[in-house]
């Protein structure tokens, strides 16, 4: 996260007019002392002396963790993933209590051939990872399942992975449909009773990059605002620039209180900034306003 | 690990009989299935015949009423009889087994095969 850099001037004063030294203190920041041994240093916003410096807790910097961090980690995870919990109906096959042993010989090879026709008939959906058999019953093989899937994550992910959730629900429902027995026989890799297929429960993985955000910003959660760039959540205050919510402070710098992003305007050897976006500019030798 | 290996195939003119056997080393006939298929030339695999350890047995509509399948569980033995040979039966006749009690002449639902007999009908 970027810090913005302080501007090399006498003095700031706020958008309201008064004249503030740097680096500024805001007032209404709740302060607390820090003390380690017989060191005491002034490790404010619940941070704490290491023994050289402060260690200062999101979102909080600077040398008394008395500023407030224009940005904040967020880490959303590279995929997500759905589970869908199935159960299908195998007729191609009778059961066997072999089959509830999941080291048996019968179980591994029911294993392989279940994987591969799933595999096969979930081949066109490329949020499909595979299959996992949790257990195996009579009826003739009952087979309760999970289907996994994943993908990368996006703000979107939800969607992807609810309209991958419907199309294994489709691709099941076929399959289980046309591939079943004829004259007590199988043509096909595996069988299915039609009316043996069922969805249990769908578990989509939860991240809200907002949630995050405003978790992390603490007593600030009202003004850090997620925005996204090349599909990546970013956790800014308006005081971080090259966003759409960027504040614009023109002649000054912008800083974080309890009651939002505030400039405090520049005043130089030859100009004095005021306004609420420092953008009204006054030469002090000719007393001349400009826009 | 389970071996199969297949005999009695050979030459044969329409309308006479022939019996296969397939000798099975790593695999116990009282669990699972065996089952015979046939490749002819250029064409795909197909499913014969399949017997279970639950006493299924069957067949595919080409054979009915002419094919009969057996096995011998002292033995480890499974045959094939074949009676009324027709020129379309000519084909590589392979032995295979699953340890699961299956209802599938679909090849791929076997897992393990032997190398195959060959069968000709031919006057």
């Known amino acids: 996260p970027l810090a913005t850099i302080p501007v090399s001037t006498t003095s700031l004063t706020s958008s309201e007019g008064s004249t503030i030294s740097t680096p500024s203190v805001d007032i209404s920041t709740p302060v607390t002392t820090s003390i380690v041994g017989d060191q005491c240093s002034r490790c404010k916003n619940g941070g704490f002396w290491d023994g050289l410096k402060c260690q200062c807790l999101t979102p909080y910097y600077g040398e008394s963790c008395e500023e407030v961090v224009n940005s904040i980690d967020i880490a959303p995870p590279e995929t997500v993933s759905a589970q869908m919990e199935l159960t299908v109906t195998v007729t191609s096959v009778k059961f066997t209590d072999e089959l509830k042993n999941h080291s048996s010989q019968e179980f591994r090879e029911f294993n392989k051939t279940f994987t591969e026709q799933m595999n096969i008939v979930y081949s066109g959906i490329p949020e499909y990872v595979g299959v996992n058999i949790t257990n195996l019953r009579l009826g003739s093989v009952v087979v309760e399942h999970d289907v996994l899937l994943r993908t990368k994550y996006t703000p979107e992910y939800k969607t992807a992975l609810d309209n991958a959730t419907e199309v294994v629900k489709q691709k099941i429902t076929k399959v289980t449909t046309e591939q079943i027995m004829t004259n007590d026989n199988c043509s096909a890799l595996m069988c299915f009773n039609t009316t043996g297929t069922q969805v249990q429960n769908i578990t989509v993985t939860q991240y809200d990059p907002v949630e995050e955000c405003r978790q992390k910003a603490e007593e600030y959660e009202d003004y850090f605002l997620v925005e996204y760039r090349d599909q990546k959540p970013y956790c800014i205050s308006p005081c971080e620039s090259g966003f759409n919510a960027s504040k614009n402070c023109n002649h000054g710098k912008c800083q974080m209180s309890q009651n939002g992003a505030r400039c405090l305007c520049v005043t130089t050897e030859t100009h004095w900034y005021s306004g609420e976006d420092c953008n009204q500019g006054t030469q002090k030798s000719h007393h001349h306003h400009h826009h | 690990e389970v071996q199969l290996v297949e005999s009695g195939g050979g030459l044969v003119q329409p309308g006479g009989s022939l019996r296969l056997s397939c000798a099975a080393s790593g695999f116990t006939f009282s669990r699972g299935s065996m089952s015979w298929f046939r490749q002819a030339p250029g064409k795909e695999r197909e499913g014969v015949a399949i017997?279970?350890?639950?006493?299924?047995?069957g067949y595919a509509d080409s054979v009915k009423g002419r094919f009969t399948i057996s096995q011998d569980n002292a033995k480890n033995s499974l045959y094939l009889q074949m009676n009324s040979l027709r020129a379309e039966d000519t084909a590589v006749y392979y032995c295979?087994?699953?340890?699961?009690?299956?209802?599938?002449?679909?090849?791929?639902?076997?897992?393990?095969w032997g190398q195959g007999t060959m069968v000709t009908v031919s006057s």
């Open positions: 017997i279970s350890s639950d006493g299924w047995t």
């Open positions: 295979a087994a699953s340890f699961l009690v299956l209802r599938a002449l679909n090849p791929k639902a076997w897992h393990y």
